[in-house]
């Protein structure tokens, strides 16, 4: 039976157009960049700029470019054989845990800690217990145990399917 | 656990449209296609046409272009197939069927609908 | 279109017993990437049809291993080892090496 392919990897189907470059597959594989046509028979280039496929495959269509978010960057456009990379903006991080949204970082460190780590885009500011050196939990302290200001309300989800 | 469960029995008059309804649950519905077979009585099954969830994008068997119109509404993860000009030889039970998006593993349907009787008379 | 031809169209069998249902195809099922794109299904009375073998010889999964398929080029075969009251049912060879995909007549198998 076929992997499934996850709302994440997947991306629309361009009909292909007559001034579309065809090729024949290669032992019923088609290139990064193009995909399988509906009879097997000719590889269809993807669409620069709206789709893409990163490896060798026999999917029936190209996988959707993905459309940075508002609060996001963009640090490399699609091409046809590899998606848009797209990062949150200054001041903003994307968990591990939660890679659909970017939430503001931390502007300071609870009482009794210190901060060692700036705010990333991958990872919040790092604070760390005065004496003792042991890391913060990450947890998000309440507003009066807060040095400064409490985080912001996170940004809205970064649409990772376009 | 996979399913696919679709509409009721529907009689129409020539003339008419139906449309039969492909709830499926069990899956990342737009992780697949959606195709159509029709069933006429006592006779074999004809493939009409497949819906890619993802993309909105239709593949039809060319017998039922202008017959057969394939949507879907993702946020239910429900699929159509609106039959129009109804003719008694559109008399059939109509099921879906899932296929996935490889072309090597595509053209095979692992699992079905239980099937919609579609009965066109006067 | 590709014509798909099964035999017998009825098959009456004991149970225990071997059964065998042919499939014939109009042209070759041998696709331009050397695959063969010939599935069986089972039909059982009152149900959908469900998936048995696909790609000639693979059984999908749950299938039991009582079911088997071979073949090549226009030319295939479902055999079932030893048949059980449960495999009755309409039996469908198709094929997706051509669009359109194609199914069979089907064939009837029943207890004798």
């Known amino acids: 039976e076929s992997a499934l392919i996850t709302q994440q990897d997947l991306a629309p189907q361009q009909r292909a157009a007559p001034q579309q470059k065809r090729s024949s597959p290669s032992e019923g594989l088609c290139p990064p960049g193009h995909h399988i046509s509906e009879d097997g028979r000719d590889c269809i280039s993807c669409k620069y700029g709206q789709d893409y496929s990163t490896h060798w495959n026999d999917l029936l269509f190209c996988l959707r470019c993905t459309r940075c978010d508002s609060g996001e960057v963009e640090l490399s456009p699609c091409t046809t054989t590899r998606n848009t990379v797209c990062q949150c903006e200054e001041g903003t991080f994307r968990e591990e845990d939660s890679p659909e949204m970017c939430r503001k970082c931390r502007t300071g460190c609870p009482r009794g800690m210190v901060k060692v780590g700036d705010c990333t885009p991958w990872s919040d500011i790092e604070c760390v217990h005065k004496e003792s050196g042991t890391k913060h939990s990450g947890e998000v302290p309440a507003v009066e145990e807060t040095v400064t200001s409490s985080p912001g309300t996170p940004a809205s989800p970064c649409s990772l399917s376009g | 656990e996979v399913q696919l469960v679709q509409s009721g029995a529907e009689v129409k008059k020539p003339g008419a449209s139906v449309k039969v309804s492909c709830k499926a649950s069990?899956?990342?519905?737009?992780?697949?296609?959606m195709n159509w077979m029709k069933q006429s009585p006592g006779m074999s099954l004809e493939w009409i046409g497949r819906?890619?969830?993802?993309?909105?994008?239709?593949f039809y068997n060319q017998k039922f272009k202008g017959k057969a119109t394939l949507t879907v509404d993702k946020s239910t993860s429900t699929a159509y197939m609106e039959l129009s000009s109804l003719r008694s030889e559109d008399t059939a039970v109509y099921f879906c069927a899932r296929s996935a998006y490889y072309f090597d593993s595509g053209g095979y349907f692992d699992y079905w609908g239980q099937g919609t009787l579609v009965t066109v008379s006067s | 279109d590709i014509v798909m031809t099964q035999s017998p169209l009825s098959l009456p069998v004991t149970p225990g017993e071997p059964a065998s249902i042919s499939c014939r195809s109009s042209q070759s099922l041998v696709h331009s990437n050397f695959n063969t794109y010939l599935h069986w299904y089972l039909q059982k009375p009152g149900q959908s049809p469900q998936l048995l073998i696909y790609?000639?010889?693979n059984r999908f999964s749950g299938v039991p291993d009582r079911f088997s398929g071979s073949g090549s080029g226009t030319d295939f075969t479902l055999k079932i080892s030893r048949v059980e009251a449960e495999d009755v049912g309409v039996y469908y060879c198709s094929q997706s090496t051509h669009v359109p995909w194609t199914f069979g007549p089907g064939t009837k198998v029943e207890i004798k």
């Open positions: 819906f890619n969830p993802y993309n909105e994008d239709t």
């Open positions: 790609k000639v010889s």
């Open positions: 069990g899956y990342s519905f737009i992780g697949y296609f």
